[in-house]
Amino acid sequence: IPVIEPSVPELVVKPGATVTLRCVGNGSVEWDGPPSPHWTLYSDGSSSILSTNNATFQNTGTYRCTEPGDPLGGSAAIHLYVKDPARPWNVLAQEVVVFEDQDALLPCLLTDPVLEAGVSLVRVRGRPLMRHTNYSFSPWHGFTIHRAKFIQSQDYQCSALMGGRKVMSISIRLKVQKVIPGPPALTLVPAELVRIRGEAAQIVCSASSVDVNFDVFLQHNNTKLAIPQQSDFHNNRYQKVLTLNLDQVDFQHAGNYSCVASNVQGKHSTSMFFRVVESAYLNLSSEQNLIQEVTVGEGLNLKVMVEAYPGLQGFNWTYLGPFSDHQPEPKLANATTKDTYRHTFTLSLPRLKPSEAGRYSFLARNPGGWRALTFELTLRYPPEVSVIWTFINGSGTLLCAASGYPQPNVTWLQCSGHTDRCDEAQVLQVWDDPYPEVLSQEPFHKVTVQSLLTVETLEHNQTYECRAHNSVGSGSWAFIPISAGAHTHPPDEFLFTP
């Protein structure tokens, strides 16, 4: 680290005095200080002498000696006061520019440390500082306004008490610039617009910024529109608004509209599309298949997308049958608006019951008429099975009825012993019935099939089981012949509930 002689932090001299500041380092050294007259610099290898034989108040300041070759960048400093009774202030700059919220240093250096107790900062012409001006003072550096605000852009003077009277410095102009975070903020309203030919329309393009210096324009397709601009200032922002009013729209007004604003930071633009139509329209669609299949007991949401102009005058979900005359509860229907002209309507069908299979229709109406979109909901059921013993054309026959959806497949098993369900070890014979007779097959209902197994003689220590399965599940019914006649039961002696 370089060493300065005299080895004191501060040196106080009178005007006209001779001042010699010597700096010695390991290598070459350099002086840095306030720009002021009458200094002579003499360098000799590792030492440098700064001297004047006629010090003035303008020599007041901090002089720093550095050693450029030092990797640690060490330096030494001495502060020189040239105390001129007529000049209490040495002003190093008459204009200071900072950004908002930065500290602003007003560099009026006190020429006599004794005066420190009586210093103050004022605005020119003796006006007091604005409220909430937070500042501090350093005799070496001057006044610092902390976290300067745009409104504090003023002309200031430094004041010192000398012999009971205030002596002012020359003025310092502070310019506090707004921090412009980026291009102006933009809004273009509406985000989308549809009108029938002959109707009125309005498009509003507005831009705002903390700084007044920005431009805004509205263009249609690629043509810049000449629209008078309204300006305003509120919430600490400058606002410029362009309003396009069209009394009677026509097809040539349709297309892309862009709102563009620019400042020194760059350009922002946002666009919207204006559609002009011949007449009202209403379109219904769904991303779902209109034919739905779910398992009984499951839940289902039916969703319809609506595109309409003008807006809907009415809409509802209706159950069209074929079962009970129940209607969907309004609380199960939900509407959400994607944007001005598109909506989604959802009907929730929780834990579906058999009587809720059928057709569900969404109806909507606007000045263009009414439209409907209908879903067909089929429920899937696991098979339910029952077996009876009967005689057909004189032959003993086991008759198995299985109902479910999709249509169940039927398999017969004959196994040894009396059991609720044949397991593999007991099975004597297996018959698949690839084409059971369909007894009933109506839309939205279970399919009921019937399979016949002709048995010449029933073996009494055996069980005959009819099994049915489909994609939902399986069901079975065991038939156990007993000496007093036939005995049938579902597995585990369960009663059959059709």
């Epitope: 007991g297 499951e298 839940g299 949401n301 939900n334 929730s348 929780p350 834990r351 019951k353 058999p354 009587s355 509930t497």
Partner: antibody, heavy 116, light 106 residues
Framework: QVQLKESGPGLVAPSKSLSITCTVS????????ISWIRQPPGKGLEWLGV???????NYNSGFMSRLRISKDNSKSQVFLKMSSLQSDDTAIYYC??????????WGAGTTVTVSS | NIVMTQSPKSMSMSVGERVTLSCKAS??????VSWYQQKPEQSPKLLIY???NRYTGVPDRFTGSGSATDFTLTISSIQAEDLADYYC????????FGTGTKLEIK
């Protein structure tokens, strides 16, 4: 107001069947659906199945092959029958009124222990 | 089946504190979520249905909210009698329940 009361065997041997009766009082059984829900010791709730007012049933797919629910409206009784019980079927079995979107009236439950 | 995941598994709170219980569904269940309180040695009792509707007789310190997959039960100021297990359940499809949150009072 509606009250539900379960009655069961308490102890069931492994591989045997379970029969529980739920008796409904304070309202007619043909006016609401009944679900069965069970709770193994120290565990959560598990829905087994429902019997609708018309007598149709809907089962949890995990129990479809060994569960049957039936009812006798005239006696205001609902029956649960489950076959092939194992130790992990040990639970409290609840009979519950089921207005479809929630379960609002619960019986006190009957404890079933599967053990030899 | 739809899986309902509850968190936390347990919590210990002081009387007067506010508590929030979370329940997440593995798929969209609209607002078909109900909350049940089960005190020791008792059967569950319905608190909230349709995600946010308070059942008859339930104190207004119990509030439910949420839709689609995320649901919350809030007890605004815990009372000593709120010591219980709390279960959420969905009834959009085959009913399923969460594993429960045990609420203990400090």
């Amino acid at each position: 107001q509606v009250q539900l009361k379960e009655s069961g065997p308490g102890l069931v041997a492994p591989s045997k069947s379970l029969s529980i009766t739920c008796t409904v009082s304070g309202s007619s059984l043909d006016s609401f659906d009944i679900s069965w829900i069970r709770q193994p010791p120290g565990k959560g709730l598990e829905w087994l199945g429902v019997i609708w007012t018309g007598g149709g049933t809907n089962y949890n797919s995990g129990f479809m092959s060994r569960l049957r629910i039936s009812k006798d409206n005239s006696k205001s009784q609902v029956f649960l029958k489950m076959s092939s019980l194992q130790s992990d079927d040990t639970a409290i079995y609840y009979c519950v009124r089921d207005p479809r979107l929630y379960f609002d009236v619960w019986g006190a439950g009957t404890t079933v222990t599967v053990s030899s | 089946n739809i899986v309902m995941t509850q968190s936390p598994k347990s919590m210990s709170m002081s009387v007067g504190e506010r508590v929030t219980l979370s329940c997440k569904a593995s798929e969209d269940v609209v607002t078909y979520v109900s909350w049940y309180q089960q005190k020791p040695e008792q059967s569950p009792k319905l608190l909230i249905y349709g995600a946010s509707n308070r059942y008859t007789g339930v104190p207004d310190r119990f509030t439910g909210s949420g839709s689609a997959t995320d649901f919350t039960l809030t007890i605004s100021s815990i009372q000593a009698e709120d010591l219980a297990d709390y279960y959420c359940g969905q009834t959009f499809s085959y009913p399923t329940f969460g594993t429960g949150t045990k609420l203990e009072i400090k």
